[in-house]
């Protein structure tokens, strides 16, 4: 019989490549059974995950699976840097995996590095 | 049933580039990374590198990096890997491998190989 | 880059003896969300490698419980408590902590 507790399915270790003044949406893979939880969405901050309050948010239906999503209208150079989505079930809270933002600053860039070349940079998260 | 299947050249030459295709079938590839891995001929096995699917982001073996390319095609569900500038000591076994998701992220399945020797 | 270097480099036991393989990482493999990702992979000849152990200890569905895997940290150890016909072949273990990846060296199990 298949679990009924919530499952966030953010991969482990992923990154995404994107671009200041781009528009971009943060997906959070929620898996549940019966009530959809309550989910969130924070910024790390060294080892302290901060929650964002008062950011576009929204849902995704597909079949098997909802996704909560965070809004970046447009994406800024303050954006880089690791998230967390966390589900309060029953009493509980399920975090996922942290994805990373490598934002390229269109403006100090003379043209758009490869997305491998951002997986070499991890200063980028700092400055 | 999840399968992955290598295809590509047996023989490349001195300089040229090599390039394999990983067929998927059974998954979704854009739920998982794939990877490749070689093996030499009588040798261990060195990691190469893996793509993420969903959005294309590769992370790469830094004494490979300048001569990869690792890229995917998610309506093919396939992967696919180019290695420039080869030499005969990149003649081995390519395997590409399937990372499977919540909560292990293991490589669970495999390919079964395709050898690729680097002669003129 | 993570080292893995595991100990012995081959193995020769007679069927029924007990294999003993360590697996030595240079930095701990502890990730961030508390999960150790030190796999254990066997190949026969010929065939690709097959996971046998992830998670340091978890077997993999269909592995006898003959083989287990233990250890934490930097220090890990793959042992079949009795060695059969079909266990020869070559072990590795496998880092999926860092990046890059890294294999250890394998070690060659014969019989006697």
């Known amino acids: 019989k298949e679990s009924c507790d919530v499952q966030l399915y953010i991969k482990r270790q992923s990154y995404h490549s994107i671009f200041a003044g781009d528009p971009f949406k943060l997906e959070c893979p929620v898996k549940y059974c019966a009530h959809r939880p309550q989910v969130t969405w924070c910024k790390l901050n060294g080892t302290t995950c901060v929650k964002l309050e008062g950011r576009h948010t929204s849902w995704k239906q597909e079949k098997n699976l909802s996704f909560f999503i965070l809004h970046f209208e447009p994406v800024l150079p303050s954006d880089n840097g690791s998230y967390r989505c966390s589900a309060n079930f029953l009493s509980a809270i399920i975090e996922s995996h942290s994805t990373t933002l490598y934002v390229t600053d269109v403006k100090s860039a003379s043209e758009r590095p490869s997305k491998d070349e951002m997986a070499s940079r991890p200063w980028l998260l700092y400055s | 049933q999840v399968q992955l299947q290598e295809s590509g050249p047996g023989l490349v030459k001195p300089s040229g580039t090599l390039s394999l295709t990983c067929a998927d079938s059974?998954?979704?590839?854009?739920?998982?990374?794939i990877h490749w891995v070689r093996q030499p001929p009588g040798k261990g096995l060195e990691w190469i590198g893996r793509?993420?699917?969903?959005?294309?982001?590769?992370r790469y073996n830094p004494s490979l990096k300048s001569r990869v390319t690792i890229s995917s095609d998610k309506s093919k569900n396939q992967a696919s890997l180019k290695l420039s500038s080869v030499t005969a000591a990149d003649t081995a076994v390519y395997y590409c491998?399937?990372?499977?998701?919540?909560?292990?992220?293991?490589?669970?399945?495999w390919g079964q190989g395709t050898t690729v020797t680097v002669s003129s | 880059d993570i080292v893995m270097t595991q100990s012995p480099d081959s193995l020769a036991l007679s069927l029924g003896e007990r294999a003993t393989i360590n697996c030595k990482s240079s930095?701990?493999?502890?990730?961030?969300?508390?999960?150790?990702?030190l796999n254990w992979f066997q190949q026969k000849p010929g065939q690709p490698p097959k996971r046998l152990i992830y998670?340091?200890?978890k077997l993999d569905s269909g592995v006898p419980d003959r083989f287990s895997g233990s250890g934490s940290g930097t220090d890990f150890t793959l042992t079949i408590s009795s060695v059969q016909a079909e266990d020869v072949a070559v072990y590795y273990c496998?880092?999926?902590?860092?990046?890059?990846?890294?294999f250890g060296q394998g070690t060659k199990l014969e019989i006697k």
């Open positions: 491998a399937r990372e499977d998701g919540y909560p292990y992220y293991t490589l669970d399945a």
């Open positions: 059974g998954f979704n590839i854009k739920d998982t990374y």
């Open positions: 793509i993420d699917p969903a959005n294309g982001f590769t």
């Open positions: 930095q701990s493999l502890l990730d961030v969300d508390g999960k150790t990702y």
């Open positions: 998670l340091v200890s």
């Open positions: 496998w880092q999926g902590t860092h990046f890059p990846r890294t």
